[in-house]
Each structure stands twice: as C-alpha cells, then as structure tokens.
C-alpha cells in the first residue's frame, strides 16, 4: 500500500483590508487534489498575535477566514490540509503546515504613541475618546483617529476632534449605526515634521464602556409604620429598564449609612419611629444581561425628607 499524502494549501496569506485590525486569512486548495475528487477537503487553521501563549484553532471547508487582531503586535498563522478518514479508507491524513506572518512595520519609538487612551460611550448614545500626546513629542505633532466596525464600508476618520494647544487630544464620534455587540476598532496615528510617530490600535465593544445618566424622579412612599419604599425612574435615553443595576446610598439622621445594589427601580427600607431625616442618592450601571462591563453613572441629585411625621403616605421633595 502506498502512503497517502496531501499537500498543504497554496498561497496562504494574511490580507489587511484597512479595517484597523480585522484581517482576512486566505489560501488556495493544495496541488494534486485530483485523487480526492469525491472528497471534501478540510483545513485546520491556527493563528494568534505574536506573544500570545495560545493559538486559536478553526477547522473549515472554506478558503478564507476573518477575525480581529491587535495590530500593535505581529500576527502568525499556520494552516494544513485535512483529508477525512472517509477519503483515505483509514485514518485522517494531514499535510505539512503552511505558515505566514503579518505585521505593520512600526514607525517611531513606542514613547511617541498616544498615552492613556480612554473611551466612554455616554448613555449608549455618544462615544467620546480622549488621550494624552506621546512622551516628548513636540507641539507640531498631531494625532488622527480612525475607526471601523462591521457594517462600515471603510475606516472613517474622526469628525470632531477635541484639541489642546492645537493638538488633537480626543474625538467626539458621530452617531454609530448598529455598532454595539461587535468589535469596534480604533487606530490613532500621528505626524510630525520632527520625528516619526508610532501608531496605536485599540479594540473594544461599545456596550462594555457605557456610562449611563443617573436615575431621576426620586421619591419616598410610606409602606407601613416601619417601612419606606424608595423609588426612582430610569434615566432618559435608549437604555431599556432591563439593562440597569442600581446602587443606593441612604443616610438616616446623618449617621447611619446604608448601601445596597438592586436590579429594580425600588428599594424598601426598614425604619424606626425615631428617624427624623432620610436622604438617598442612586446611580446606575449597565448590568450583566446587557454587557460584560460598564461604568457607574454619576450619583443622582439627593432626595431628602426632613420632619417629625414620617407617617405621611407619600413624601416628595
């Protein structure tokens, strides 16, 4: 019996379509597949950012694959052909590996790239990113921000830069149609007559950097002689009620501080007849049902009740 062999895929390459980190891995079928015309050939693809300990592994019948990478680092990938056991009357046959790498030739020293990049998606409506200029760069250095997410035809430049001393130090993004729950890619590059500037690449998902508005319309309602219900409304905007967690801070008579985290827009507080003053504030955050992470809102305006008669049905400021 002659040993069955198969060649690795041809023309294996990593293609950068200009999407700031979303790359195409593509290849052609191996040579000499004539013997296996009745057979569906598969490919095992492994890839990673250089420096990563683990490979991502994909088995596919296609001749391409797409995924996001960190372009601050290089990318390495390898692929081989798989002939399933049905094609070989026995065990699976694998080709040798075809390998390829990709990296963007870095310009400038690392210190010239932007520092302390910070992006917040305010109230799931307005994206604002800010940064500090690189270390030791001159005032003639300017930074430009580009972004892309799946659904855009090409990477777009920032529309509204925030400036300090004539330098771009931030970006107010235009509206971002259907941009959450997918990777959002940013590149901040720079130019200077003095020296080359290192580009920086960032990837995140918008729903994970949401900072909501604080809750509004805080009220008290007497439930019983020893219970008061605190109520508030969800902040205005596009975030649905089911997406909020709340943190409450309650102060009784300037001494007792109660803090609680709740999922609803109410909290029932046990009180004593001696209570003379009650104040509370609330803040909101997008919960685990709608995001993997988030930023607490500012605290709401304080709502207080002061006086002797805590037996009133409804207590409003």
């Amino acid at each position: 019996d002659t040993e069955i062999k198969v060649n690795p895929p041809q023309d294996f390459e990593i293609v950068d379509p200009g999407y700031l980190g979303y790359l195409y891995l593509q290849w052609q079928p191996p040579l000499s597949l004539d013997h296996f015309k009745e057979c569906t050939v598969e490919y095992e693809l492994k890839y990673r950012n250089i420096g990563s300990e683990t490979w991502k592994t994909i088995i596919t019948k296609n001749l391409h694959y797409k995924d996001g990478f960190d372009l601050n680092k290089g990318i390495e990938a390898k692929i081989h052909t798989l002939l399933p056991w049905q094609c070989t009357n026995g065990s699976e046959v694998q080709s040798s590996w075809a390998e390829t790498t990709y990296w963007i030739s870095p310009q400038g020293i690392p210190e010239t790239k932007v520092q302390d990049m910070d992006c917040v998606y305010y109230n799931w409506q307005y994206l604002l990113c800010s940064w500090k200029p690189g270390i030791g760069v001159l005032l003639d250095t300017n930074y430009n921000l580009f972004y892309w997410y799946e659904g855009l035809d090409h990477a777009l430049q920032c529309v509204d830069y925030i400036k300090a001393d004539g330098q771009n130090i931030g970006c107010r993004f235009p509206y971002l149609e259907a941009s959450d729950y997918k990777d959002f890619y940013i590149c901040v590059n720079g130019s200077s007559e003095n020296k080359p500037i290192r580009s920086s690449y960032f990837t995140f998902q918008l729903q994970n950097i949401v900072k909501p508005l604080p809750p509004v319309y805080l009220t008290f309602t007497r439930e019983s002689s020893c219970e008061i219900k605190l109520k508030w409304s969800i902040p205005l905007g596009p975030i649905p009620a089911r997406c909020f967690d709340y943190e409450i801070e309650i102060r009784e008579d300037d001494t007792t501080l109660v803090t609680a985290t709740v999922e609803n827009e109410t909290y029932t507080l046990k009180t004593t007849n001696e209570t003379r003053q009650l104040c509370f504030v609330v803040r909101s955050k997008v919960n685990i049902y709608c995001s993997d992470d988030g930023i607490w809102s500012e605290w709401s305006d304080k709502q207080c009740w002061e006086g002797e008669d805590l037996s009133k049905k409804t207590l409003l400021r």
């Epitope: 307005y126 529309v159 509204d160 925030i162 300090a164 130090i169 107010r172 235009p174 508005l213």
Partner: antibody, heavy 119, light 111 residues
C-alpha cells in the same frame, strides 16, 4: 433633566457691551459643545459661535467682526457670550444651545435672553 | 459661507394633510459619509426644537410623523399627517462648516 438656564433680559445703550450667561445642569458640561444663536424680532436664526468646554476651543461667526467673545467656567458649568459695540440691530433674543459634535445637531436650548439696544 | 434656501416661504395646509418642506444648500453639506443637515421647529415665544439631525435621524422624543431625507445639496422635511400642534416655523441648518447657517424658514400655517 438637562437644563440650560440663561441670565435675565437686558436693556443697553448703543456702544455698550452685554454679557449673557448660560448655566448648564443635568449632564456633563465638558462633553458637549455650547453654541450661541440669536434671533432678531420677526427674523430667522443666526449662529454666533460655539465653545468646546472640554478644551476651550472656540469658533466664531466672522460676521460679528470680533465683537463677540465666548467663554466658559467649567467649575460652574456655565458658558458666557459677550457682545460689544452694541447697535440697534443687535436687539434680539440670544440663545445658548448644546450639541454633541457637529453631526448631532443642537438638542437642548436655553430659554433665551432678550437684549434690547436703545438710546 | 454655505447659504440655505428654504421653500416655500409659507405653506398653508389642513390638519391630517401631508407637508413637504424643502431646503437647498449652495454647496454640498456632505462629509465623512454624513449629511450635516438638521431641521428645527419653532413656535412663537419658544426656543427652537431639534426635529431631525444628520438629514434623516430623529431627535429625541420626536414623533414618527416627522422624517427627513436628502443628501448633498437637496433636503426635505416631511410631516406625514399634520397635527394641530405642528403649525409653526421650520428651519433647516447646516453644521458641515463654520459659520453654521440657517435657512430663512418655512411658516406652516393652518389653511
């Protein structure tokens, strides 16, 4: 919750200056551009300029030929518009109006400040 | 500066009818794939109210009967079915370049 509260009506003589304030609340003041727009009696709207409270960057309408000065006090969440060398045609209602960047339009407006220039 | 011309200057219609207001710019207000055209409604004694931004996107709390369309130099505000509270003055405004400019307004009055 977003509110822009402007200072009260003013009556000024020709050649004088007027300074209108706009106190913002219910949002993070530095995140939004603040615009100033005026409207003469029975007339349309005229954009005067804008300030970015985040960094103090300002754009002016050159039609006002250096007569307008826009400033802000971020600690007080307040923007100001000063118009100098007043003339009778400056009689108008002056509005402050916030907007998040140029692609979003101007979504909240102050109540307006009436400025009358008369000798 | 970019000059905006609104037409008609006055539009007389009855409640329940469809209103179509036009705005033409002296040069394109498109950039970055966005049309920097906004529409405002103003009633006597009140500040303007943002209806539409970026040519076609509804402002917060604006009823669905208000819609915007267009790109480049020609833009339209449509009110699909007029309500009594819709009779007011409507302004278009460009925010592509400084100075931001407004159209002269269209007065929508009850027939």
């Amino acid at each position: 919750q977003v509110q822009l509260v402007q200072s009260g009506a003013e009556v000024k003589k020709p050649g004088a200056s007027v300074k209108v304030s706009c106190k913002a609340s219910g949002y993070t003041f530095s995140n939004y551009l603040m615009n100033w727009v005026r409207q003469a009696p029975g007339q349309g709207l005229e954009w005067m300029g804008r300030i970015d409270p985040y960094d103090g960057d300002i754009d002016y309408n050159q039609n006002f030929k250096d007569r307008v000065t826009i400033t802000r006090d971020t600690s007080a969440s307040t923007a100001y518009m000063e118009l100098s060398s007043l003339r009778s045609e400056d009689t108008a209602v002056y509005y402050c109006a916030r907007g998040y960047g140029t692609a979003y339009g101007v979504d909240y407006w102050g109540q307006g400040t009436s400025v009358t220039v008369s000798s | 500066e970019i000059v905006l011309t609104q037409s008609p200057a006055t539009l007389s219609l009855s409640p329940g009818e469809r209103a179509t207001l036009s705005c033409r710019a002296s040069e394109s207000v498109d950039n970055y794939g966005i049309s920097f055209m906004n529409w405002f409604q103003q009633k006597p004694g009140q500040a303007p109210r943002l209806l539409i931004y970026a040519a076609s996107r509804q402002g917060s709390g604006i009823p669905d009967r208000f819609s915007g369309s267009g790109s480049g130099t020609d833009f339209t505000l449509t009110i699909s079915r007029l309500e009594p509270e819709d009779f007011a003055v409507y302004y278009c405004q460009q925010s592509k370049e400084v100075p931001w400019t407004f159209g002269g307004g269209t007065k929508l009055e009850i027939k």
